[in-house]
Amino acid sequence: DYKDDDDKAWVWRPFVVLEEMDDIQCVGKLRSDLDNGNNSFQYKLLGIGAGSFSINERTGEICAIQKLDREEKSLYILRAQVIDTTIGKAVETESEFVIRVLDINDNEPKFLDEPYEAIVPEMSPEGTLVIQVTASDADDPSSGNNARLLYSLLQGQPYFSVEPTTGVIRISSKMDRELQDEYWVIIQAKDMIGQPGALSGTTSVLIKLSDVNDNKPIFKESLYRLTVSESAPTGTSIGTIMAYDNDIGENAEMDYSIEEDDSQTFDIITNHETQEGIVILKKKVDFEHQNHYGIRAKVKNHHVPEQLMKYHTEASTTFIKIQVEDVDEPPVFLLPYYILEIPEGKPYGTIVGTVSATDPDRRQSPMRYYLTGSKMFDINDNGTIITTNMLDREVSAWYNLTVTATETYNVQQISSAHVYVQVFNINDNAPEFSQFYETYVCENAESGEIVQIISAIDRDESIEDHHFYFNHSLEDTNNSSFMLTDNQDNTAVILSNRTGFNLKEEPVFYMIILIADNGIPSLTSTNTLTIQVCDCGDSRNTETCANKGLLFIMGFRTE
């Protein structure tokens, strides 16, 4: 009897039916208390899902008439109606009843979040969590073990393990990215907690190893051979060295440096784009001084975390043999420039001095010398400079010469040096009037009146100050009209020695003056001072005399 004890309405106990059954399953009967068995009552099913079930109209027996899928519909709510066929009316109000579909294990576990991919650092310790995979089973989790899953590893031993109940994948053995950088792990999920008859599903997990800096850079070669020309300027790149690092990315970035270079001639810089070490010339090299060098270079990673320092203890080193290439170098003068001295007035062929250049190369080529800058000098193959003319300091006190040296073996190799020749003074010039004097004396001049102040110059150079001595020539007997007084300051004063002059009788006087210098030996010159008599009028001022003289010359008379 499936009817509830309560008579007021039809409240049915649930019916159950197994899913996925091919045969017709009868699940129970509906019966009205009013049914007396005379077959006048007719039972009917109404509601969604009524098409999946049939009811025997006479007996009220309900049967599933098609295969049911719990995962598609687990519950059918149907309405039942009882009709009295004799009167054609429902004898009771419609009543709902439920048919529950019972689960069978007809669904395998499925991994819904595929594809799975995980990244884990290489050399991670055992037990490190990699990823969790989760499978779903459409069967009823509340019905037995149909949806209770167990996970297992089909591929990935011995490096990985999976927790059976959670699907958590962990590392079970350390892995080295440099040996293998990715692994495919296959995980199986079984329902029925793995019991016989269980269904299973699998998934693949791509596990990539990320790089850690567990490898130090190592030089490709234990010895590098490089060459450098002795003419190479500082800063020249003379070659490259290279190390390799099995790590990748930032972990493979390296820095090269000099470990040993007693000569301190070279440096190494790092090209971070190519990860090469560039050997640089730090100091000029000279084949004649040292024709080969040995340096030791080392290489280290740029970024090394403290915990990975154990992998980076001894830095890799390499030896670099550097051969200096000989270059035929131009001659080298012993001095950058020469200052030579010679007194003026020496005869031609006098030796001024010697310059010297040498071949810095080992073969020591002889030299040839050439001189430019003045025809007053010449040079021989020994570098000796001689005069070709007598030198006069008063014409030129300095000569700026250029001496060129060439190698006899290779005339293309040329060097030049400046030679400055200073011509020394000798006292070969007597002093003379410092200017031309236009001297006038007034007709009405008084005795003792100043007629002219004179000074002298000397073209010679004086180490001390020049000192001039002025004297009236003893031969100048006719000139007692004037008197000379040496002021002792390189000037002298000419004084009138009488009162009054006559322009018509004696218009001009010539006074012979001797000027001597203080050179050794002293030189004296004879100088004539022309003194013109002038009609100055009462003023006794000679300022107008020059104009009068000019007019006189032009044929004019002045009153």
Partner: antibody, heavy 119, light 107 residues
């Protein structure tokens, strides 16, 4: 083991030529710079010439420059010294020597071959 | 060129005695680029010391080298019969030059 064997020595008149050979074995010949060194009878050692591992560079002592030529044939593992315009003062035992890989000293020497220059 | 002068010219010693040989350079030898060789009569020279103080392969530790710059020395702590030979120093700082040799003879 490393072996260097010189040959080609003999008596020669002044002004004439001679070619010495040095057969190398027991090491990678193409990786080493090679030298010739000579020793006049009863005298000390005198360095003569060097050739680089790849044959691109050669250097000579001033006393032989322009007269002697050093060369090598890697395919035959052989070092040569071509001696022209020979003089009496070139009379000596000629040794070939291998330069140390990480240095410039000579770690292996041949037994030598005697060259006598006389009229 | 760098000239090497060895002294003494001859050293007369008995087996078991200590020998000290000197080598002086006319100018400084860079990076201690100096080697020592010995040569027995009728034989080729043999490398003993390179880099002024490093022993060559197979050379017994009774041989030791020292020095830098212009003054170098080779010491044989206890002479064995086979050590009586001519010893040469060689610089390879600039080209290659040898000293004139020191003869170590049995007293």
């Amino acid at each position: 083991q490393v072996q260097l064997v010189e040959s080609g020595g003999g008596v020669v008149q002044p002004g004439r030529s001679l070619r010495l050979s040095c057969a190398a074995s027991g090491f990678t010949f193409s990786s080493y710079d090679m030298h010739w060194v000579r020793q006049a009878p009863g005298k000390g050692l005198e360095w003569v010439a060097v050739i680089s591992y790849d044959g691109t560079n050669e250097y000579y002592a001033d006393s032989v420059k322009g007269r002697f030529t050093i060369s090598r044939d890697t395919s035959k593992n052989t070092l040569y010294l071509q001696m022209n315009s020979l003089r009496a003062e070139d009379t000596a035992v000629y040794y070939c020597a291998r330069e140390r890989y990480f240095d410039w000293s000579f770690d292996y020497w041949g037994q030598g071959t005697l060259v006598s220059v006389s009229s | 060129e760098i000239v090497l002068t060895q002294s003494p010219g001859t050293l007369s010693l008995s087996p078991g005695e200590r020998a000290t040989l000197s080598c002086r350079a006319s100018q400084s030898v860079s990076n201690t680029y100096l080697a020592w060789y010995h040569q027995r009569p009728g034989q080729a020279p043999r490398l003993l010391i390179y880099g002024a103080s490093s022993r060559a392969t197979g050379i017994p530790d009774r041989f030791s080298g020292s020095g830098s710059g212009t003054d170098f020395a080779l010491t044989i702590s206890s002479l064995e019969p086979e050590d009586f030979a001519v010893y040469y120093c060689q610089q390879y700082s600039n080209s290659w030059t040898f000293g004139q040799g020191t003869k170590v003879e049995i007293k």
